[in-house]
């Protein structure tokens, strides 16, 4: 039975086996085509989601589709039902929390009262000015809180108490990539993790431990990537894994927050990386223990210099490392989070690519998560 499962796939009607390597190869080998059903699927970027959250106290903004202008949501007459609608528009299914925060004198966007129409937030027609003088601060999910704060050092062993959103993504019980829990159903990782194996069956997620072998595996229902863009082959290195059963959150299993749409991190901003990846370039072995390291944002211009990546780093990527080199993500860390701490921890990057590991002029290159928020929200909405 184990051997059969490992090397063969059972087609139905009529029942017969096909070699597992014929799964997800683009050819219908089973009469009903089920060999091409449970495969990595691509999902387009989709339309603009008409709500977003700002790094200014997680305040809600709403798009006026007629003009293309964004507006801040006034707290006047804002209700729990409107909060739920806003979060559903971003694909969240959990119960949101919201509060009033004072408008500041440097408020740039205009402020409008919000209403609902066909399960979408809209600006209320001919509403008055914002009498409360307050904006809506909205949290769709409790996220980004860990039991333990890491110390700022170079590289050290990590505890799952510090990084309860970190998961190991495994194929045939072998660790392939890292990933981050975003909500009970969804894990964020890199698309390139699935290049070799595009069948969903053998992929598993392990959560809740900092040791590689020691935690139960979770079945995966779907793996979703963005359509490949041949113009920018290294772009779109992002994937969402939908778990078959929702996670139960605990001290060691918790979600990390997505970044705000306007989360612009300046060079030298401190960030953290974690993973079970190789501890040496081109050799060594996977680390059995989760490792953590503090790095910093490296300016894209510097990263694209002639002695570095020579223009390969696009606007949808970011670089991080330490200027003198020596601290970096490596093979096996792919898909894991690049993290920023404000009030909560945010996954601002996904470990993607780089030349070597830890070189001074070639730091790690990360998928910029804020560039894909729209895609993430559209995937979640489609799967609600």
């Amino acid at each position: 039975k184990v051997i059969l499962d490992k090397y063969y796939f059972l087609c139905g009607q009529p029942l017969h086996f096909i070699p597992r390597k014929q799964l997800c190869d683009g050819e219908l080998d089973c009469p009903l085509g089920e060999d091409e059903e449970h495969c990595v699927k691509s999902f387009p970027e989709g339309p603009a989601v008409a709500v977003r959250l700002s790094k200014d106290r997680s305040t809600l903004q709403v798009l006026d589709s007629a003009t293309g202008n964004w507006f801040s949501a006034c707290f006047d007459n804002f209700t729990e039902a409107l909060a739920e609608t806003a979060c559903r528009q971003m694909g969240y299914s959990s119960k949101p929390t919201f509060r009033a925060v004072e408008i500041g004198p440097d408020q740039d966007l205009d402020v409008v009262e919000i209403t609902e129409n066909s399960q979408e937030l809209r600006m209320r027609n001919s509403s008055g000015p914002c009498l409360s003088g307050s904006l809506v601060s909205l949290h769709c999910l409790a996220c980004g809180k860990s039991l333990k704060t890491p110390r700022v050092v170079g590289v050290e062993e990590a505890s799952v108490d510090s990084w309860p959103w970190q998961v190991s993504i495994q194929y045939d019980k072998q660790h392939v990539c890292g990933g981050s829990i975003l909500d009970p159903h969804w894990v964020l990782t890199a698309a390139h993790c699935f290049r070799k194996h595009t069948d969903v069956f053998n992929w598993k997620v392990r959560a809740g431990s900092d040791k590689l072998g020691s935690f139960p595996s979770l079945a995966v229902a779907k793996i979703i990537i963005i359509e490949f863009n041949p113009m920018y082959p290294k772009d779109n290195d992002i994937a969402l894994m939908k778990l078959q059963f929702p996670l139960t959150f605990s001290g060691t299993v918790r979600p990390i927050c997505l970044p705000f749409f306007d989360e612009e991190l300046t060079p030298a901003t401190p960030l953290w990386i974690i993973g079970w990846g190789f501890t040496k370039q081109n050799g060594g072995k996977m680390s059995d223990i989760l490792l953590q390291a503090s790095v910093q944002v490296i300016d894209s211009t510097r990263c694209n210099a002639d002695d570095a990546y020579q223009g390969e780093v696009t606007e949808k990527m970011m670089c991080a490392g330490i200027p003198e080199g020596g601290v970096d993500t490596c093979q096996g860390d792919s898909g894991g989070p690049l993290m920023y701490q404000s009030d909560q921890w945010h996954v601002v990057g996904i470990v993607s690519w780089g030349y070597g590991c830890g070189g001074p002029s070639t730091p790690g290159v990360y998928t910029k998560v804020s560039a894909y928020l729209n895609w993430i929200y559209n995937v979640w909405k489609a799967e609600l």
Epitope: I103, G104, P105, D110, S126, S127, G128, P129, C130
Partner: antibody
């Protein structure tokens, strides 16, 4: 684009009243507070009060309490400022000014062209 | 009421000069401060709000700074079209109050 067009110049006798209008266009009239500010010849700017065009609610500077009345007509998107018991020191250019965003504490951004009111016997 | 005191009341400068105008509030106003430019016979024009935010369409040679009670408007390189009167204004509390104005004249 946002426009505030005020009524023409007025000459009034002391003790009389004047009513200045300010017609708004290019935006949702009810969504923004409107201030009235005046400027005597060769002098600085003096705030008179505000009106909420949605509710008609007003707030006046202490100096003008009892003499000033601000009203609005939502059907024509027009606000009015009436000043009574005029005296010579009320000779000034009167401006209506809309706030930058729909919030009371944002500064006036859009201004009318001004209405000169001359009080002379 | 919050008093706004501007200085100097007038100044003479040449094209290309760096010009600084100060405004002092009689009590703390956080950063609820705006600056206006007014030319003769025209309505005031908003240059800066929230102490340092440049209003859209205003040249970057204008900048604002300060907080609490002391504020500054700086014109980094005076241009011919900048000769005008400048007012500060607080919107921290009603009544809104303006400074007395600073007239920038050609030397």
């Amino acid at each position: 684009q946002v426009q505030l067009v005020q009524s023409g110049a007025e000459v009034k006798k002391p003790g009389a009243s004047v009513k200045v209008s300010c017609k708004a266009s290019g935006y949702t009239f009810t969504g923004y507070y409107m201030h009235w500010v005046r400027q005597a010849p060769g002098q600085g700017l003096e705030w008179m009060g505000w009106i909420n065009p949605n509710s008609g609610g007003t707030h006046y500077a202490q100096k003008f309490q009892g003499r000033v009345t601000m009203t609005r007509d939502t059907s024509t998107s027009t606000v009015y400022m009436e000043l009574s018991s005029l005296r010579s020191e009320d000779t000034a250019v009167y401006y209506c000014a809309r706030v930058r965003i729909g919030w009371l504490q944002s500064p006036p951004l859009y201004w009318g062209q001004g209405t000169l009111v001359t009080v002379s016997s | 009421d919050i008093q706004m005191t501007q200085s100097p009341s007038s100044l003479s400068a040449s094209v290309g000069d760096r010009v600084t105008i100060t405004c002092r509030a009689s009590q703390g106003i956080s950063n609820y401060l705006a600056w206006y430019q007014q030319k003769p016979g025209k309505a005031p024009k908003l240059l800066i709000y929230a102490t340092s935010r440049l209003q859209s369409g205003v040249p970057s040679r204008f900048s604002g700074s300060g907080s609490g009670t002391d504020f500054t408007l700086t014109i980094s390189s005076l241009q011919p079209e900048d000769f005008a009167t400048y007012y500060c204004q607080q919107s921290y509390k009603t009544p809104l109050t303006f400074g007395g104005g600073t007239k920038v004249e050609i030397k």
